[in-house]
Interface confidence: low
């Protein structure tokens, strides 16, 4: 015997209190597949969020982040505040980064430089806040670990993980 | 499902240090910003700290920055929160969470009792 | 940080509609969750997204957000619905800021 709820298509419920007939899915709900006992609730944009799709009886709404705002997490759970390029964010705000560290990006975290000695290079152009230094070829009589910026701390990846 | 379980608390002189633990399991802990939230006895709900999911962001209240640092653990699925400098009124149950972010549940640990006292 | 105001205690008979207030500036602006807390247990969510019930949670309980206070309403209050209520406000980003929290009391 067929379930009757399977004939109900995305943007509507199967009705328990109406003889399990299709109804439309209430205001701020949505279906997007077919034979749904219930209809979920719309995703709200609030805060920092803005709205980058509304919500229709078959698709959810979907949110990004304000202007000066970048998403974090699957979905854009959240927000996360910009900062320029020779940055990185705190909780204090934004701070400019350490010597000896760079972030070309207005997000995540400052990064050290590159140590070119590792690689038995020099250092061909200065890093910055903002740019990693550049290695060159090493010069004559170059011995590895005696031209180049020594990293403070080692490299950490941004989290991009939902809060 | 989800569990959350604290330890670690327990009683230390002000000026002293403690570390907290928090075991997660249920879930994939590496996916999820973490949070450390206090209480102190007969008060509210305090929101302490948090660390994302990969461990290289932090952020503390104001109260206990400088103090305090988060830090995980995603190969044992542990949260630590590392408490130096303790005074009188870090005494407080602290619990480990992982809060409400516009998809997932709530869950939150049953909290370990930090008393700072001489 | 948004600082949310929440009164000390409210008491309702048993079968009587309790609702319990969360301020702050704006605060319809930003998400809203509400916390039952039991004698020496761990809080447990009861509504989110400012009226939205998690899995699990009776029907009585229900919330609202809008200006500068939110709301969480308990039709029908039952004895076993005497807790702590703490509000809790998020605008998305990091951190995160709770209520001082209100003694329900079921008479």
């Known amino acids: 015997l067929q379930d009757p709820c399977s004939n109900c298509p995305a943007g509507t419920f199967c009705d328990n209190n109406r003889n399990q007939i299709c109804s439309p899915c209430p205001p701020n709900s949505f279906s997007s597949a077919g034979g749904q006992r219930t209809c979920d609730i719309c995703r709200q944009c609030k805060g920092v969020f803005r709205t980058r799709k509304e919500c229709s009886s078959t698709s959810n709404a979907e949110c990004d982040c304000t202007p000066g705002f970048h998403c974090l997490g699957a979905g854009c759970s959240m927000c996360e505040q910009d900062c320029k390029q020779g940055q990185e964010l705190t909780k204090k705000g934004c701070k400019d980064c350490c010597f000896g560290t760079f972030n070309d990006q207005k997000r995540g975290i400052c990064r050290p430089w590159t140590n070119c000695s590792l690689d038995g290079k020099s250092v061909l152009v200065n890093g910055t806040k903002e740019r990693d230094v550049v290695c060159g070829p090493a010069s004559a009589g170059f011995s590895p670990g005696t031209s180049s910026v020594t990293p403070p701390a080692p490299a950490r990846e941004p989290g991009h993980s939902p809060q | 499902q989800v569990q959350l379980v604290e330890s670690g608390g327990g009683l230390v002189q002000p000026g002293g240090s403690l570390r907290l633990s928090c075991a997660a399991s249920g879930f994939t802990f590496s996916d999820y910003y973490m949070h450390w939230v206090r209480q102190a006895p007969g008060k509210g709900l305090e929101w302490v700290s948090v660390i994302s999911g990969s461990g290289s962001n932090t952020y503390y209240a104001d109260s206990v920055k400088g103090r305090f640092t988060i830090s995980r653990d995603n190969s044992k699925n542990t949260l630590y929160l590392q408490m130096n400098s303790l005074r009188a009124e870090d005494t407080a149950v602290y619990y480990c969470a992982r809060l409400y972010a516009q998809f997932e549940g709530d869950f939150w640990g049953q909290g370990t009792l930090v008393t700072v006292s001489s | 940080d948004i600082e949310l105001t929440q009164p000390p205690s409210v008491s309702v008979a048993p079968g009587q509609t309790a609702r319990i207030s969360c301020s702050g500036d704006n605060i319809g602006s930003k998400y809203v969750s509400w916390y039952q807390q039991k004698p020496g247990q761990a809080p447990v969510l009861v509504i989110y997204?400012?009226?939205e019930r998690p899995s699990g949670i009776p029907e009585r309980f229900s919330g609202s957000n809008s200006g500068n206070t939110a709301t969480l309403t308990i039709s029908g209050t039952q004895a076993e619905d005497e807790a702590d209520y703490y509000c809790?406000?998020?605008?998305?980003?990091?951190?995160?800021?709770f209520g001082g929290g209100t003694k329900l009391t079921v008479l």
């Open positions: 997204s400012d009226s």
């Open positions: 809790q406000s998020w605008d998305g980003s990091i951190s995160r800021v």
